[in-house]
Interface confidence: low
């Protein structure tokens, strides 16, 4: 049979390295020779390219090499597919050199910001060594910062005289870094380069962009001044990069704007001794470059009433992340702050707090929370400058299994009674939350029994035993990743009782 | 920890040519470009090019362009430079040093020992 | 080529005296410029970059300022390993030209 029709012809110029056809060469049940015949210089010349190998992978596809090949063109191309049985051609094909040229890369060399010019950084670059003398090239600037992975594209073309191989790259974030890709084609070709190597650049650094600013409460002292702490971090959505030299801190009674105190301090925190009325607070950061707009809080009376709204909430692990979510009663809330700290014995030294606006669920990255730690996490819903009384719950971010099992001990023994008591693991050693104890006993070569109570329960009475006979008891602390047994307790029930 | 180790000095005769190794330890070598840099009498540097071994692209300083070749083995992350033709001006040492790349390119973080080269017949 | 001037070309001074050597590029470089000091014998060892930021490793007594074309490394309370050869370098395109140095040497 005749060889298939060669479909689907496909021509590249690798700009002066060669031009590749290639096609579709049909299902072939004999050996097949291809010829791909080119007319070029205007149709005033003419050649062949044979493929020459016997894996038909490669036989479909063949290459023109310089110095035969010159830009502007127009070529025909035709492949014909000879076989024992006869020849059979392609359709004639139409190319323009110009359209299907492609380049290597540019090269950028370098990304920088322009002095005094705000949110923009001009990348310079080298055109690619091989490209067209006669043609403009058309760029594609590919940038992200370098904490993101979506990529913003711009186009834009340069005349073949333009020396100046810059771009300024405008309606940037402030004081943050860019990774930056570019490629290049001839204007009239169909084919980009491949992407050049990344580089990074940075925008200007602008003053501060604003602060997020939260307190934390304590117990009046005894002469009636009320210790407040006051935190605070760069606003969300601040340049990750973003500098600050300080703070300014200025505070005064709701009732009097004319005692004003002033402070500054360069660390992220500061401790008030606050009298019992009520107070606003308000503070800057600044560096170099200015201030940042004016961040305020008020801190209620010692006697105000807060408002109560949470009426539910709760703690879950989904795909990764820690979900807390809460129902309120308050419709007009929806500004919340999420305060969270590692349940230790001692005062929290690490605790961290973020807001959520129109939403009643926060979620936090799982390993942003250490595994098998215990979290306090509160919930403050806040409106307008109330805030109000928060709800706390505990959770874990990762359970796992309790590293110690409980400390157990027997009371009361009786002939057919005992009492096993346990005591609860200590909070460093639970790994997660105990949802429930098993007991494990056994009479010597006897068969084993279990009971499981929850966990609010430290003792639980074993019945029906055996008189005069050993038994060994052991019991279990589960969390939702698995159990860890206690060490294992002898006892001998008694012979007879005193009510015998 | 980073390390670029250079190979030993040489003494060579005029009109032949020679090649520095620069073998990098302790990063990622196709990560970070390395320049090659010229000290003569123990005072001026000059800069002769660089080479970028993820890709092997070179780019040379006009001044050497006919006196330095660049060339990377990234299989043992060794850099080489070869230098041609030479004469008693090409006396110097040579260093290798690592472009920093994060900190704006060509500046230079981590440098090798340096090859002492005396051309002498 | 920009051509990179550094002056003086040696200075002595002191252990804990504070010290400034200068450097000029005869076209705007903006802050694309880097010290190093070299002690004899030695390679190189990069000091600022940026013109003002100051390489991982380098005691803070070490301070670089200056944009444009004109800028100064400055050290406060000199120490004895502070002595040796101190160059600037701009970074700003190719080819990166180095100043001819300033020789720091002990009173």
């Known amino acids: 049979a005749l060889p298939a029709k060669p479909e689907n012809i496909s021509c590249v110029y690798y700009y002066r390295k060669n031009l590749t056809c290639t096609w579709s060469p049909g299902k072939e049940t004999s050996y097949t020779q291809y010829t791909v015949k080119r007319t070029y210089a205007f149709g005033e010349k003419h050649d062949n390219c044979t493929t020459n190998s016997s894996t038909s992978e490669n036989r479909a596809s063949c290459s023109f090499f310089l110095p035969r090949i010159t830009i502007p063109d127009n070529y025909t191309i035709e492949v014909e597919a000879e076989n024992g049985d006869g020849v059979i051609k392609s359709h004639m094909t139409y190319w323009r050199l110009e359209n299907i040229a492609k380049t290597e890369p540019p090269k950028i060399f370098r990304v920088k910001p322009v002095l005094g010019i705000k949110r923009m950084i001009q990348i310079e670059w080298i055109k690619p060594e091989l490209a067209p003398v006669s043609s403009d090239l058309k760029y594609t600037l590919r940038f992200r910062t370098v904490n993101s992975t979506s990529w913003m594209e711009v186009n834009f073309a340069k005349n073949r005289k333009d020396k100046n191989q810059t771009y300024n790259l405008t309606g940037l974030q402030p004081f943050t870094e860019y990774v930056i890709a570019l490629r290049c084609a001839v204007k009239e070709s169909k084919f980009w380069s491949d992407w050049s190597q990344e580089k990074m650049g940075m925008t200007e650094e602008e003053a501060p962009c604003g602060l997020e600013l939260w307190r934390v409460l304590k117990p009046a002292e005894a002469d009636g001044r009320r210790p407040v702490r006051l935190l605070w971090k760069k606003a969300r959505g601040a340049p990750v990069l973003e500098k600050t030299l300080g703070y300014n801190i200025w505070y005064y009674p709701e009732s009097n704007t004319n005692l004003t105190e002033t402070m500054n301090t360069t660390n992220q925190q500061l401790e008030l001794h606050l009298g019992g009325e009520s107070f606003w607070v308000s503070m800057i950061s600044y560096n170099s470059l200015g201030k940042s707009p004016v961040a305020t809080l008020r801190i209620p009376a010692i006697q105000e009433k807060s408002f109560q709204c949470i009426e539910v909430m709760q703690a879950c692990v989904a795909e990764d992340q820690l979900v807390v979510k809460w129902q309120s009663s308050a419709l007009d809330v929806n500004t919340w702050m999420i305060e969270w700290f590692p349940d230790v014995d001692s005062e929290p030294t690490t605790l961290s707090w973020e807001s959520v606006s129109q939403a009643t669920n926060w979620t936090i990255q799982q390993d942003k929370l250490k595994p098998f730690w215990c979290y306090n996490i509160s919930v403050y819903p806040m409106l307008h400058d109330k805030v109000g009384e928060p709800y706390s719950i505990q959770a874990y971010a990762k359970e796992g299994v309790p590293s110690e099992g409980p400390e157990t001990k027997v009371e009361n023994i009786g002939v057919k009674t005992v009492t096993i008591t346990w005591k609860e693991i200590p909070k460093s050693e639970r790994k997660g939350i105990i949802c429930n104890y098993t007991i494990f006993y056994q009479a010597e070569g006897g068969k084993g029994f279990s009971k499981t109570v929850n966990s609010s329960i430290l003792q639980y009475g074993l019945e029906s035993l055996k008189r005069k006979t050993s038994y060994i008891v052991q019991v279990m602390a589960s969390t939702s990743a698995g159990g860890t047994n206690g060490t294992s307790i002898n006892f001998k029930t008694l012979s007879f009782s005193v009510f015998e | 920890e980073v390390q670029l180790q250079q190979s030993g000095p040489e003494l060579v005769k005029p009109g032949t040519s020679m090649k520095i190794s620069c073998k990098a330890s302790?990063?990622?070598?196709?990560?970070?470009?390395m320049n090659w840099v010229k000290q003569s009498h123990g005072k001026n540097l000059e800069w002769i090019g660089l080479i970028n071994p993820y890709n092997g692209g070179a780019e040379y300083n006009q001044k050497f362009k006919d006196k330095a070749t660049f060339t990377v083995d990234k299989s043992s992350s060794t850099a080489y430079m070869e230098l041609l033709s030479l004469t008693s001006e090409d006396s110097a040492v040579y260093y290798c040093?690592?472009?920093?790349?994060?900190?704006?390119?060509?500046?230079?973080?981590?440098w090798g020992q340096g090859t002492s080269v005396t051309v002498s017949s | 080529d920009i051509q990179m001037t550094q002056s003086p070309a040696s200075l002595s001074a002191s252990v804990g005296e504070t010290v400034t050597f200068t450097c000029r590029a005869n076209e705007n470089i903006y802050s694309y410029l880097a010290w190093y000091q070299q002690k004899q014998g030695k390679s190189p060892q990069l000091l600022v970059y940026?013109?003002?930021t100051l390489a991982e490793g380098v005691p803070s007594r070490f301070s670089g300022s200056g944009s444009g074309t004109q800028f100064s490394l400055k050290i406060n309370s000199l120490q004895p390993e502070d002595f040796g050869s101190y160059y600037c370098?701009?970074?700003?395109?190719?080819?990166?030209?180095f100043g001819g140095g300033t020789k720091l040497e002990i009173k």
């Open positions: 040093a690592r472009d920093g790349y994060d900190d704006g390119p060509y500046t230079m973080d981590y």
């Open positions: 370098q701009h970074h700003y395109g190719t080819p990166p030209t």
């Open positions: 940026n013109a003002k």
């Open positions: 302790g990063y990622s070598f196709t990560g970070y470009i």
